[in-house]
Amino acid sequence: TTELTEEKYEYKEGQTLEVKCDYALEKYANSRKAWQKMEGKMPKILAKTERPSENSHPVQVGRITLEDYPDHGLLQVQMTNLQVEDSGLYQCVIYQHPKESHVLFNPICLVVTKGSSGTPGSSENSTQNVYRTPSTTAKALGPRYTSPRTVTQAPPESTVVVSTPGSEINLTNVTDIIRVPVFN
């Protein structure tokens, strides 16, 4: 069985998570993309793009915005006004149909904590960019630049760019892609 290694990201309530998922291969350009959360062992689709995807045509579902750039092989995910209950495991996926998706990225373990007033972390303006590139193995690929597994939110008005992993993957074998059932 294949297990994905997650990366942990810590935020305060009210902040914004921004994730960029890099899917690169042309065969996925016109596929629907989705942002899912693991609930127990079952993934739940929170938002998915339209089909066919259009460049810079955002899809908004509540506090989640998906923006697909099929001509550049990028999916941008934004979750605003984070709440403690948003904590959990998230993934970008290529959405095939309700029962199956292709997971292309190591999961993000989001930890949202209560922000105490007056602390730097409680600013709603503070955004952390997380860059995802395809993973073809169960093990997380080591980052090109040394960075901790746990990333704590930066002070307001600043952006921390976390790039994991450092090099792009040559997806020559479709069996490298992990398939998981999806129930929504």
């Epitope: 960029k20 042309e26 990028l74 074998n173």
Partner: antibody, heavy 121, light 111 residues
Framework: EVQLVESGGGLVQPGGSLKLSCAAS????????MHWVRQASGKGLEWVGR??????????YYAASVKGRFTISRDDSKNTAYLQMNSLKTEDTAVYYC????????????WGQGTLVTVSS | DIVLTQSPDSLAVSLGERATINCRAS??????????LHWYQQKPGQPPKLLIY???NLESGVPDRFSGSGSGTDFTLTISSLQAEDVAVYYC?????????FGQGTKLEIK
């Protein structure tokens, strides 16, 4: 190991035609866009054009300097990309490289050794 | 078309010293905060070799004395400590828009 091997270069007269081939191995050819880049002797690199994959309807894109004269095609069953060059001009004289990117609009990670095309009377 | 202008055209640096090459784009080569700007090294009689992709990512197998930075329209390739084998021509290239374009090249020599 990814390998790209160009062939078909040679001497041709102005106004003539030539077809270059790029034989690919070591990867799933049908998955990637293929590009042609050229370099005149002692000059810089010039992107010639690219052909996308079947999922992108084999769309092609060209530099303005070759548009209407050059045609890029591919045969996924033969793992080969082609560059058909018509109405050749002396300024088309160059080494022609076949390259493979790392995905949509990604970098050129793999290059062939190049084939020399000389357009002269 | 996006025009990439490299500076300087040629550069002579002493062994062990830092070499810096700049690349300026006529318009932004960024999409969704990704810079589609890459750096290549070419030695005589050889095809180009990828050094840096998407502005700052070191290609596998490339020595870490090479680094890239920048976003939008202004980019820099830096060699922290020049080695004899770094003598070559260096090119920037953008893939954000068709047609893809290269800079005119920068020739790096040893002083």
């Amino acid at each position: 190991e990814v390998q790209l091997v160009e062939s078909g270069g040679g001497l041709v007269q102005p106004g003539g035609s030539l077809k270059l081939s790029c034989a690919a191995s070591g990867f799933t050819f049908s998955t990637y866009a293929m590009h042609w880049v050229r370099q005149a002797s002692g000059k810089g690199l010039e992107w010639v054009g690219r052909i996308r994959t079947k999922s992108s309807n084999y769309a092609t894109y060209y530099a303005a300097s070759v548009k209407g004269r050059f045609t890029i095609s591919r045969d996924d069953s033969k793992n080969t990309a082609y560059l058909q060059m018509n109405s050749l001009k002396t300024e088309d004289t160059a080494v022609y490289y076949c390259t493979r990117d790392m995905g949509i609009r990604r970098q050129f990670a793999y290059w062939g050794q190049g084939t020399l095309v000389t357009v002269s009377s | 078309d996006i025009v990439l202008t490299q500076s300087p055209d040629s550069l002579a640096v002493s062994l062990g010293e830092r070499a810096t090459i700049n690349c300026r784009a006529s318009e932004s080569v960024d999409t969704a905060d990704y810079s589609f700007l890459h750096w290549y090294q070419q030695k005589p009689g050889q095809p180009p070799k990828l050094l840096i992709y998407r502005a700052s990512n070191l290609e596998s197998g490339v020595p870490d004395r090479f680094s890239g930075s920048g976003s939008g329209t202004d980019f820099t390739l830096t060699i922290s400590s020049l080695q004899a084998e770094d003598v070559a021509v260096y090119y920037c290239q953008q893939s954000n828009e068709d047609p893809y374009t290269f800079g005119q090249g920068t020739k790096l020599e040893i002083k």
